[in-house]
């Protein structure tokens, strides 16, 4: 014959174990339902009769079967450099993560108990390793023939462009500025335009700075009719 | 008209040097980039490196830097690539080619190219 | 692997039209830089055959077009001849390299 299914409360076999979603309690001796999540232990079982259980008050949860006499306390409301990634109900506690542009400094089991904003590089660094959700982006010296003019936590050293003839070399900070070799329509006869117009995004009909300039930022400078003389300053 | 001839290929052992010349004619050879682009054995192009009209700034691809040199003498209207410490993998044929007019990003002349075997 | 994609291969018979595409990144066709593109005969060099997207060098034929949009290229033949059989190649400037990336290339076939 089958055994018989035991309902909650019951008395364990010597030397068993109660089953799953069910706990030993002590003082009854028996084995007593748990409470689902989102519910907590109102009313303890006893010889005669099973758990009762009761859902958890606003700002309180429990996110596993349980037998607790009162939920958790969801955790306090998210910091200003913080997001709410996870809002608190009767099942789960309120996660916060870092917002973008910060990371963790200090973790807790879940989320972050403290945030620190990502570093950013100053003009003449690039970043060597980007920063993540739990570390601090790495700096770096922009290398011969690479360049960062900006201040920022993402942005890498970019090579210096390529120009036919340099105007002002570049350096760790600031791209190469060409000379262009011919003035596009726009431009004034024996104007020098830096950087160069066309080695760049392309606009046909007026020249284009390069990616560094600020965008509809063009310069011209003046010069004779003749091209530029090499010099020490460039090509 | 423009025309580039390259000349200084052959067979160097791992390890060993070569230096490339590129003869150019037919246009203001110091008022243009001049690049260097290599082709392996039956695969694609790729480019190597690069340095301005007068010769004051140098480029280069990642797989070549240290290794690998580029001048001009603007007198003899002439491009050089040194090349040292020579592996397998630089065997390919080289082309000189000039920046296009305007913008150095494009090639608007090649040379034949010379073929490097990096061989033992 | 090249920083432009390409398909390997393309064919077609004479006097239809077939594109070759080329796709590439927020850091070189899609930051805005021209797409070039260069024809490569059998045992020949390269040979520039539209700069600046869509331009066309002297001497190269109006059945050769190309065109430019987001983050990829294409370049178009119509009436497609034998002698078109060739290696096609794209290129264009990165932000992240120092010099012009290319695409792998793509040989192009023409059938019958």
């Known amino acids: 014959l089958p055994a018989q299914v035991a309902f909650t409360p019951y008395a364990p076999e010597p030397g068993g174990t109660c089953r799953l979603r069910e706990y030993y309690d002590q003082t009854a001796q028996m084995c007593c339902s748990k409470c689902p999540p989102g519910q907590h232990a109102k009313v303890f079982c006893t010889k005669t009769s099973d758990t009762v259980c009761d859902s958890c008050e606003d700002s309180t949860y429990t996110q596993l079967w349980n037998w607790v006499p009162e939920c958790l306390s969801c955790g306090s409301r998210c910091s200003s450099d913080q997001v709410e990634t996870q809002a608190c109900t009767r099942e789960q506690n309120r996660i916060c993560t870092c917002r973008p542009g910060w990371y963790c400094a200090l973790s807790k089991q879940e989320g972050c108990r403290l945030c620190a904003q990502l570093r950013k590089c100053r003009p003449g660094f690039g970043v060597a390793r980007p920063g993540t959700e739990t570390s601090d982006v790495v700096c770096k010296p922009c290398a011969p023939g690479t360049f960062s003019n900006t201040t920022s936590s993402t942005d890498i050293c970019r090579p210096h462009q390529i120009c036919h003839v340099v105007a002002i070399p570049g350096n760790a900070s600031m791209d190469a500025v060409c000379t262009s070799t011919s003035p596009t329509r726009s431009m004034a006869p024996g104007a020098v335009h830096l950087p160069q117009p066309v080695s760049t995004r392309s606009q046909h009909t007026q020249p284009t700075p390069a990616p560094s300039t600020a965008p509809g930022t063009s310069f011209l400078l003046p010069v004779g009719p003749s091209p530029p003389a090499e010099g020490s300053t460039g090509d | 008209e423009v025309q580039l001839l390259e000349s200084g290929g052959g067979l160097v052992q791992p390890g060993g040097s070569l230096r490339l010349s590129c003869a150019a004619s037919?246009?203001?050879?110091?008022?243009?980039?001049m690049h260097w682009v290599r082709q392996a054995p039956g695969k694609g192009l790729e480019w190597v490196s690069a340095?301005?009209?007068?010769?004051?700034?140098?480029y280069y691809a990642d797989s070549v830097k240290g290794r690998f040199t580029i001048s001009r003498d603007n007198s003899k209207n002439t491009l050089y690539l040194q090349m040292n410490s020579l592996r397998a993998e630089d065997t390919a044929v080289y082309y000189c080619?000039?920046?296009?007019?305007?913008?150095?990003?494009?090639?608007?002349?090649w040379g034949q190219g010379t073929l490097v075997t990096v061989s033992s | 692997q090249s920083v432009l994609t390409q398909p390997p291969s393309a064919s077609g018979t004479p006097g239809q039209r077939v594109t070759i595409s080329c796709t590439g990144s927020?850091?070189?066709?899609?930051?805005?830089?021209?797409v070039h593109w260069y024809q490569q005969l059998p045992g020949t060099a390269p040979k520039l055959l539209i700069y600046?997207?869509?331009q066309r060098p002297s001497g190269v034929p109006d059945r050769f077009s190309g065109s430019k949009s987001g983050t990829s290229a294409s370049l178009a033949i119509s009436g497609l001849r034998s002698e078109d059989e060739a290696d096609y190649y794209c290129?264009?400037?990165?932000?992240?390299?120092?010099?012009?990336?290319f695409g792998g290339g793509t040989k192009l076939t023409v059938l019958g």
């Open positions: 080619a000039k920046g296009g007019t305007g913008d150095p990003y494009y090639f608007d002349y």
């Open positions: 340095i301005s009209g007068g010769a004051t700034t140098t």
């Open positions: 600046r997207n869509n």
């Open positions: 037919g246009f203001t050879f110091s008022s243009y980039a």
């Open positions: 290129a264009a400037r990165d932000d992240g390299l120092s010099g012009p990336v």
């Open positions: 927020s850091s070189n066709i899609g930051a805005g830089y021209d």
